[in-house]
């Protein structure tokens, strides 16, 4: 039979960040390629990765087409002889399908993790200091161009600012809905700052890992009387 | 179902500490910010501070820094409050809450605090 | 530090009245403002929050209002079970802050 010696794919694990969505599995094949197939609840199974030898796909450009959709998608085992035929050849030779298994189901929009944010700018003007996130492009497009974060999640995604005078270890704390904040400093100090995205409405990947620390008196701030 | 439940209360002397302990069930805290809360008999609702327990980051009112220290163990998904030397003004009921970042959606039942000699 | 001052402090009211508390802050708050219910012996409820969004399971005659540092929240028609001390927080920027409170007792 066509599927004598292959092995199921095993561990199938999403992962993903800001949208760039990849789906990993064990094990390393012998004797074996894999094929991986992807579709939404209600649509046809589309084909990727077709005889790879690598535990990996990448399905993003799958997804982005509607991010708050549910993805299904498996990865089939198919005896090393079957690869070398084409495309058509996904089934084995008397026509029975390779072993298979199912990944659980993908939610880009609620599954996806926040990727690290980053500290664009900021100004200080007397005693205020505005800071500035940078607004991360995303792999989902409308009309022609790459969407942001921000245009993807929308007011579903709120950043949080950690700061600190650079003399204290006391920390403040500050939220937006927006990518920018205006906060109040004392006067001749220093401060630095960190940011970290959160989707509220989440259970689980709700938070970012914490932005890298950026301190006034660095190149990436501008101070105005 | 999501449960905080807080312990470690009682009755401790001026200038002596005590720790007091929050331990949720039905999600991780590592995923949430969580903060103490507390409320002085016939008295309104008083923010203590708060931690991300993914990364240890702590906020407090400054009124409580140095004395009060707010930490969290994720193997245990239990938030914590040190309190030291204690003031009869520190009696109260401490709250521990979780914090979904638009709103505090769940807390616990309250422990309460008397400091007395 | 943001101050909240609420007011009243207590008040007195007939079932089927309408009900009004506000906060002000000393400072814009850009919303972030929630209203918490907390009867006697019990942790606080969750009524409202983001200034004007009505929490899961909460009777649509509660509504809360406004923007900036200027909070309403109202009460449209006052039913026995909202016998309660009221309060309101602003967590947009640490320390967070609770408003004094707002005794409610039906006359």
């Known amino acids: 039979s066509g599927t004598t010696n292959t092995v199921a794919a095993y561990n199938l694990t999403w992962k993903s960040t800001n949208f760039k969505t990849i789906l990993e599995w064990e094990p390393k094949p012998v004797n074996q390629v894999y094929t991986v197939q992807i579709s939404t609840k209600s649509g046809d199974w589309k084909s990727k990765c077709f005889y790879t030898t690598d535990t990996e796909c990448d399905l993003t450009d799958e997804i982005v087409k509607d991010v708050k959709q549910t993805y299904l998608a498996r990865v089939f085992s198919v005896p090393w002889r079957n690869s070398t035929h084409g495309k058509e050849t996904l089934f084995g030779t008397h026509g029975e399908e390779p072993p298979f298994t199912n990944a659980r189901k993908f939610l880009p929009y609620r599954d996806t993790k926040l990727g690290q944010p980053t500290i664009q700018s900021f100004e200080q003007v007397g005693t205020k200091v505005n800071v500035t996130v940078e607004d991360e492009r995303t792999l989902v497009r409308r009309n022609n161009t790459f969407l942001s974060l921000r245009d993807v999640f929308g007011k579903d995604l709120i950043y949080t600012l950690y700061y600190w005078k650079s003399s204290s270890s006391g920390k403040k704390t500050a939220k937006t809905n927006t990518n920018e904040f205006l906060i109040d400093v004392d006067k001749g100090e220093n401060y630095c700052f960190s940011v970290q995205a959160v989707i509220p409405s989440r259970t689980v990947n709700r938070k970012s890992t914490d932005s890298p620390v950026e301190c006034m008196g660095q190149e990436k701030g501008e101070f105005r009387e | 179902q999501v449960q905080l439940v807080e312990s470690g209360g009682g009755v401790v002397q001026p200038g002596r500490s005590l720790r007091l302990s929050c331990k949720a069930s039905?999600?991780?805290?590592?995923?949430?910010?969580m903060h103490w809360v507390r409320q002085a008999p016939g008295k309104g609702l008083e923010w203590i501070g708060l931690?991300?327990?993914?990364?240890?980051?702590?906020i407090y009112d400054p009124k409580f820094q140095g004395r009060f220290t707010i930490s969290a163990d994720n193997s245990k998904n239990t938030l914590f409050l040190q309190m030291d030397s204690l003031r009869p003004e520190d009696t109260a009921v401490y709250y521990c809450?979780?914090?979904?970042?638009?709103?505090?959606?769940?807390w616990g039942q309250g422990t309460p605090v008397t400091v007395s000699s | 530090d943001i101050q909240m001052t609420q007011s009243p402090s207590s008040l007195s009211a007939s079932v089927g009245d309408r009900v009004t508390i506000t906060c002000k802050a000393s400072?814009?708050?850009?919303?972030?403002l929630n209203w918490y219910q907390q009867k006697p012996g019990k942790a606080p409820k969750l009524l409202i929050y983001?200034?004007?969004s009505l929490a899961d399971g909460v009777p649509s005659r509660f509504s809360g209002s406004g923007s900036g540092t200027d909070y309403t929240f109202t009460i449209s028609s006052l039913q026995p079970e909202d016998i309660a001390t009221y309060y309101c927080?602003?967590?947009?920027?640490?320390?967070?802050?609770f408003g004094q409170g707002t005794k409610l007792e039906i006359t």
């Open positions: 809450a979780r914090d979904n970042s638009y709103y505090f959606d769940y």
């Open positions: 039905g999600f991780n805290i590592k995923d949430y910010y």
């Open positions: 931690i991300d327990p993914e990364n240890g980051n702590t």
């Open positions: 400072q814009d708050i850009r919303k972030y």
């Open positions: 983001y200034a004007t």
């Open positions: 927080l602003q967590h947009g920027e640490s320390p967070y802050t």
